[in-house]
């Protein structure tokens, strides 16, 4: 199978949604578990991670093509305690898969504002707590 | 089909290495892992670890002073080694894709 | 360690009953158990994953629930070439660990 996950980020007024999005073939859902960790650079697990989100095959989809499902993590306001390096990942333990997404890193500035360095260059992202807008 | 096959001598020496070649068709192991379990005569069944599609490993920490898995993906073969056999390691030891299929077990007597 | 309390040792039925076995983990496993058959000689074949996910190809006479610390493994309307011994598995913590096992037999 052709598994891969993937990070992005985006934001809504002062809330920042972390997201991993695991892309895979409906058959291959089943047995996985998705997960979010927090500066965990060699024990990322579902028991050490911020949230897990654990994959159903879903008898609605009809055909074989690549299909995506989303773990989404919700900081409602981004403070210091949030800076750190982050990663998504996932496994399945009945088939032996394991999959790590890239790290990327939350930096809150002493302006107060922070930053999101890390994932794809269309994804970099800069926030403003003050403006509520990406810059 | 999926196929695993394990193979490696049936007779090893106390205080020796043990050298087990698990051989898989059908998948490839950079797709997915392979677990390494046993289950000494008669008894239960345990896990000793596992090397995961990226290459990673994981080991069961009662045997990871003395255990070690690798593979060469280019022949679709996975390896265990392991040191300072006892009696007690005298067991039938199975590679498994993940959890879902597993070979046929190599016997392995430990007995001078 | 996680410790997996498999009962009972050993069942003896007749075709066609219905028969459950028992898994008691010493800690909160969150539904990552599975359920193995094996048979004399042979290796283990996976039957259910996930407390309740019936593996592919397995008859859907075999079900399996709980959570928590306790699951269970129900098989409906014994069949002959059900005789075996079936073993419950943990993998929510390193070190994977198996129950003792059941051997089911026939009356």
């Known amino acids: 199978g052709c598994i891969n996950i993937t990070s992005s980020a985006s934001q809504e007024g002062t809330r920042l949604n972390l997201i991993c999005t695991v892309w895979h073939k409906k058959e291959e859902a089943e047995g996985f578990v998705v997960f979010l960790c927090k500066d965990r650079s060699g024990d990322c697990s579902p028991e050490t991670s911020l949230k897990q989100l654990r994959l159903k095959r879903d008898p609605g989809i009809d055909g074989v093509g690549e299909i995506s499902s989303q773990l989404m993590f919700t900081i409602s306001q981004v403070t210091p305690l949030h800076s750190g390096t982050y990663q998504c990942c996932a496994r399945s333990q009945k088939s032996g898969i394991r999959l790590q997404g890239h790290f990327f890193s939350i930096l809150f500035t002493e302006t107060g504002n922070y930053t999101v360095t890390g994932l794809k260059q269309r994804q970099h992202l800069e926030f403003s707590h003050n403006e509520g807008t990406l810059s | 089909q999926v196929n695993l096959q394990e193979s490696g001598p049936g007779l090893v020496q106390p205080s020796e290495t043990l050298s087990l070649t698990c051989t898989v068709s059908?998948?490839?192991?950079?797709?997915?892992?392979i677990n390494w379990f046993r289950q000494p005569p008669g008894k239960g069944l345990e896990w000793m670890g596992t090397?995961?599609?990226?290459?990673?490993?994981d080991y069961n920490s009662a045997l990871k002073s003395r255990l070690s898995i690798s593979r060469d993906t280019s022949k679709s073969q996975v390896f265990l080694k392991m040191n300072s056999l006892q009696t007690e390691d005298t067991a039938i030891y199975f590679c498994?894709?993940?959890?879902?299929?597993w070979g046929q077990g190599a016997s392995v007597t430990v007995s001078s | 360690d996680i410790q997996m309390t498999q009962s009972p040792a050993s069942l003896s039925a007749s075709l066609g009953e219905t028969v459950s076995i028992e898994c008691l983990a010493s800690?909160?496993?969150?539904?990552?158990l599975a359920w193995y058959q094996q048979k004399p000689g042979k290796s283990p074949q996976l039957l259910i994953y996930?407390?309740?996910s019936l593996q592919d190809g397995v008859p859907s006479r075999f079900s399996g629930s709980g959570s928590g610390t306790q699951y269970s493994l129900k098989i409906n309307s014994l069949q002959s070439e059900d005789v075996a011994t079936y073993f419950c598995?943990?993998?929510?913590?390193?070190?994977?660990?198996f129950g003792s096992g059941t051997k089911l037999e026939l009356k």
């Open positions: 498994a894709r993940g959890m879902d299929a």
């Open positions: 059908g998948f490839s192991l950079t797709n997915y892992g």
């Open positions: 090397i995961w599609n990226d290459g990673g490993t």
């Open positions: 800690e909160d496993i969150y539904n990552n």
């Open positions: 996930y407390a309740n």
């Open positions: 598995q943990q993998y929510n913590n390193y070190p994977f660990t």
